[in-house]
């Protein structure tokens, strides 16, 4: 990747990622410098007859750093603080080639939950107020509610009326998605409304 257009790479929290390095064809490489947010990460001197000299200059990421045979950078056990700008400078006898990357760390979605604040009206219509959540949600998480393949809401919240006298059994499904994972959780309108009905009759007695 040229320095003008960084390659955006997605990494998953806790997993590994490789920033691919392309070599100038047919040229002998003198050394390679890897930088993270403009700070030196590693300095590599390739050798034709023996293993390369690898000097890791950033102790914070050092134990999680590895390099492939082509000196691509491998970073394991990814942390949120690994997010940022990476650059590789390949120096040959005649030129210096720069490759730029932007690494963004995404979380696998976990622990989807639905909370219910529903109420029963005197005409026995049940109004469902459902809220969907996942652990550590950020702005890259998309929520939606579906029933029978139709999207009823594009937000974590769903408000819908359900009348047991005219509606058949209905499941409402929350789907939470980001670029690397998706989770879903279904609730039964009949079950939720029966619970509300029990509470309603209990308070009337």
């Amino acid at each position: 990747q040229s320095s003008l257009t960084p390659l955006m790479v997605n990494g998953i929290l806790g997993e590994s990622v490789t920033l691919p390095l392309e070599f100038p064809a047919g040229e002998k490489v003198n050394f390679i410098t890897w930088l993270f947010n403009e700070t030196s990460l590693a300095f590599i001197v390739p050798h034709e007859t023996k293993s390369p000299e690898i000097h890791v200059t950033n102790p914070k990421q050092g134990k999680r750093l590895n390099f492939t045979q082509s000196y691509s950078l491998q970073l394991s056990n990814l942390k949120m603080e690994d997010t940022g700008s990476y650059r590789a400078q390949i120096s040959t006898k005649t030129s210096a080639k720069l490759s730029s990357y932007t690494l963004r760390i995404l979380r696998q979605l976990r622990n989807i939950q639905v909370t219910n604040h529903s109420q029963l009206f005197q005409n026995m219509t049940c109004e469902l107020h459902l809220t969907c959540s996942v652990e550590d949600a950020d702005d890259n998480v998309s929520f939606r509610w579906e029933a029978l393949g139709n999207t009823l809401s594009s937000q974590p919240n769903l408000t819908v009326s359900w009348d047991p006298r005219i509606s058949s059994e209905q499941d409402y499904t929350c789907i939470a998605e980001n670029a690397v994972s998706n989770l879903s959780f279904s609730v039964s309108a009949q079950k939720l409304c029966e619970d509300v009905k029990i509470q309603y009759t209990d308070t009337k007695m």
């Epitope: 790479v9 009823l152 809401s153 594009s154 937000q155 789907i175």
Partner: antibody, heavy 118, light 106 residues
Framework: QIQLVQSGSELKKPGASVKVSCKAS????????MNWVKQAPGQDLKWMGW????????RYADDFKGRFAFSLDKSVNTAYLQISSLKAEDTAVYFC???????????WGQGTTVTVSS | QIVLSQSPATLSLSPGERATLSCRAS?????MHWYQQKPGQAPRPWIY???NLASGIPARFSGSGSGTDYTLTISSLEPEDFAVYYC?????????FGGGTKVEIK
């Protein structure tokens, strides 16, 4: 049927403020996020951000933090975009667009032209 | 932010010809949406989640792709298809649109 109807064109002087409205009908307003998109003359589309129509919480793209404000009046199913301290570069057509999920904008307002000129 | 590059910027074709519009993302995205816009009008939803046609969109349109490369194809151009087409990603905030491909009559 489902539709979004926006307020009419506005001609404003630099430094003034403008408030664009977007009235929704034909669906449950509080179930779908409302997005705002800018299109400057001869330019492409630029996503400004969105507002959660249930909670009223706005989210702004970095380029639209500061002078831009999204708000709601749920009683009349209307979303608003307010721009303060108007500049010449705010001259554009502003669209509201409903999010159907996965930030797919399935219904758009007709657009409101805001012209900033001294 | 994820940058979407559409190519070509302009496609000059005759009715009946096949049109292939490309959208390349600077980072892998899970799906792509497409919109059509005609002069003086709001964009119209065209294809959602890579390959699903929006309501009322004719079957001569199709969408495909994955990762960083997505395509909108029109199998045989009709006069009403000449317009600007935008791709849009949802995987990362800010949601971004491509620069558009203008399909014009040759």
């Amino acid at each position: 049927q489902i539709q979004l109807v926006q307020s009419g064109s506005e001609l404003k002087k630099p430094g003034a403020s403008v408030k664009v409205s977007c009235k929704a009908s034909g669906y449950t307003f509080t179930n779908y996020g409302m997005n705002w998109v800018k299109q400057a003359p001869g330019q492409d589309l630029k996503w400004m951000g969105w507002i959660n129509t249930y909670s009223g919480e706005p989210r702004y793209a970095d380029d639209f933090k500061g002078r831009f404000a999204f708000s709601l009046d749920k009683s009349v199913n209307t979303a608003y975009l307010q721009i303060s301290s108007l500049k010449a570069e705010d001259t554009a057509v502003y669209f509201c667009a409903r999010d159907y999920g996965r930030w797919y904008f399935d219904v758009w307002g007709q657009g409101t032209t805001v012209t900033v000129s001294s | 932010q994820i940058v979407l590059s559409q190519s070509p910027a302009t496609l000059s074709l005759s009715p009946g010809e096949r049109a292939t519009l490309s959208c390349r993302a600077s980072s892998s995205v899970s799906h792509m949406h497409w919109y059509q816009q005609k002069p003086g009008q709001a964009p119209r939803p065209w294809i959602y989640a890579t390959s699903n046609l929006a309501s009322g969109i004719p079957a001569r349109f199709s969408g495909s792709g994955s990762g960083t490369d997505y395509t909108l194809t029109i199998s045989s151009l009709e006069p009403e298809d000449f317009a600007v087409y935008y791709c849009q990603q949802w995987s990362s905030t800010p949601r971004t649109f491509g620069g558009g491909t203008k399909v014009e009559i040759k």
